[in-house]
Amino acid sequence: EQKLISEEDLAAKKVVLGKKGDTVELTCNASQKKNTQFHWKNSNQIKILGIQGLFLTKGPSKLSDRADSRKSLWDQGCFSMIIKNLKIEDSDTYICEVENKKEEVELLVFGLTANSDTHLLEGQSLTLTLESPPGSSPSVKCRSPGGKNIQGGRTISVPQLERQDSGTWTCTVSQDQKTVEFKIDIVVLAFQKASSTVYKKEGEQVEFSFPLAFTLEKLTGSGELWWQAERASSSKSWITFDLKNKEVSVKRVTQDPKLQMGKKLPLHLTLPQALPQYAGSGNLTLALEAKTGKLHQEVNLVVMRATQFQENLTCEVWGPTSPKLTLSLKLENKGATVSKQAKAVWVLNPEAGMWQCLLSDSGQVLLESNIKVVPTWPTPVQP
């Protein structure tokens, strides 16, 4: 004969938050540490599981194939229910009946997913959507790997992803003073640097490197380097290439300059020599397979030339230099110096000795070229 359970036998309802796809354990303890009869039911009073004799029995609920109990803890008076592979619709009030007592546990299951692929190009937007049970009013707070905090309700939006947003985002869902934490791995597809400048003396070899800020097991796409020489009126495609499983293969390359491109990542290009006509800026684009948009990296080449013609010593630079850069001509071990915030400096009738041409930024030397000035003897007058 079933004994009716009075209101005072009903313990205060507990709230448990669960994550979609995870496992949750709803606890239920008897006052006596011994094996006794118990049942777990849902809010519709449908039996989920319980004990019959010494055996675990399951009822006709939708949870029957995902619900279980720790038999090893029964003789300690612990009659928990474990639910595997949680679903949002598992959110419900579950009732444990043991020793003529009822324990109610409210289970709220949440899911947090990225609306699109978790591999996104720099500048693209990321939207995280919270799945929650009807009637709940959760709040969400996410922290990016770079320490950026974003709050929201059912959705959280990051309008423009940056390189530093790559990594594990930690999102905390709060409901009824309880929290559950989600971790979402976001990969921002970008080059490590947005822009880089290479400073070279005329005639030196030039190496451009374009390291990626991410790693993928299979990396496939195509790319191109467009170059705008300072002296040219329009830009020109220097090289086009394909990327298949991290192998770079050149498709088309300009004949001047004679570029070479490495077949391994990171993307790497070499020019046999820096010449004033190559000074300028380039834009390397990389389109990845199955991704809309392109990755970009700007690269600049600044070329320096020091020359002596008759009684004029000149130092020039070509390429994109900022107005705050200083160009100087300096005689070694002497005080003689001429400096300008310009792209050319010169000295008339320079003293003999080793002259240095320096391109500097706030005292830091970016590029230097040495030129030896030999003494010029006056030409003897013919009798």
């Epitope: 070899q205 030039v206 190496e207 298949k244 499983n245 991290k246 192998e247 293969s249 050149v250 070479q260 491109m261 490495g262 077949k263 391994k264 790497h268 070499t270 046999p272």
Partner: antibody, heavy 119, light 107 residues
Framework: EVELLESGGGLVQPGGSLRLSCAAS????????MSWVRQAPGKGLEWVSG????????YYADSVKGRFTITSDNSKNTLYLQMNSLRAEDTAVYYC????????????WGKGTTVTVSS | AIQMTQSPSSLSASVGDRVTITCRAS??????LGWYQQKPGKAPKVLIS???SLQSGVPSRFSGSRSGTDFTLTISSLQPEDFATYYC?????????FGQGTKLEIK
């Protein structure tokens, strides 16, 4: 242990053709890039041709471009070099070599097969 | 194609000597250069990859270094089994190119 075994060498007249094979054992063929390297009698090593692991990309030295074709059959774990319009200067020992993961170096070489082009 | 200029073409040395062989690349090739040893009638064997990575089983007396586009193979103390021909190989880009080789002979 990875092993490479070349075959198909022999004596051929100028203008003739020959197909070299390189059978690989102990590796997943499609994972690695492969190359053919030759050595003329008393001379140094010359890289001849290469193929990516997927078999999609093929590469040739200028000296053989248009005459030689590199292919691979992943199901047979075999690399091939089809040599047409052979010349006396193609006379050499031909080695096949496997590249390391991520193409770091040629880490495994076969013993070589001799090709002699002579009338 | 990238040219690899190897020097010297031959070298006479004694057991215990320190020897260096140099390869110069016509283009920048990063560290994408390997050193190979070949003995008469045998296939080449890799000693060093990526400029300075010693392959397993290769004695530590072999080392590699780079300065710009100049690459060096050093044998710190020659052993009798080191007398062979040495080649550098650039695998930066296709077509790959070998140096002309350095024949190391007993003085």
């Amino acid at each position: 242990e990875v092993e490479l075994l070349e075959s198909g060498g022999g004596l051929v007249q100028p203008g003739g053709s020959l197909r070299l094979s390189c059978a690989a054992s102990g590796l997943t063929f499609s994972t690695f890039a492969m190359s053919w390297v030759r050595q003329a009698p008393g001379k140094g090593l010359e890289w001849v041709s290469g193929i990516s692991g997927s078999g999609e990309n093929t590469y040739y030295a200028d000296s053989v471009k248009g005459r030689f074709t590199i292919t691979s059959d992943n199901s047979k774990n075999t690399l091939y070099l089809q040599m047409n319009s052979l010349r006396a200067e193609d006379t050499a020992v031909y080695y096949c070599a496997k590249e390391g993961y991520n193409w770091n170096y040629m880490d495994v070489w076969g013993k070589g097969t001799t090709v002699t082009v002579s009338s | 194609a990238i040219q690899m200029t190897q020097s010297p073409s031959s070298l006479s040395a004694s057991v215990g000597d320190r020897v260096t062989i140099t390869c110069r690349a016509s283009h920048g090739i990063r560290n994408d250069l390997g050193w190979y040893q070949q003995k008469p009638g045998k296939a080449p064997k890799v000693l060093i990859s990526e400029t300075s990575s010693l392959q397993s089983g290769v004695p530590s007396r072999f080392s590699g270094s780079r300065s710009g586009t100049d690459f060096t193979l050093t044998i710190s103390s020659l052993q009798p089994e080191d007398f062979a021909t040495y080649y550098c190989l650039q695998d930066y880009t296709y077509p790959y190119t070998f140096g002309q080789g350095t024949k190391l002979e007993i003085k």
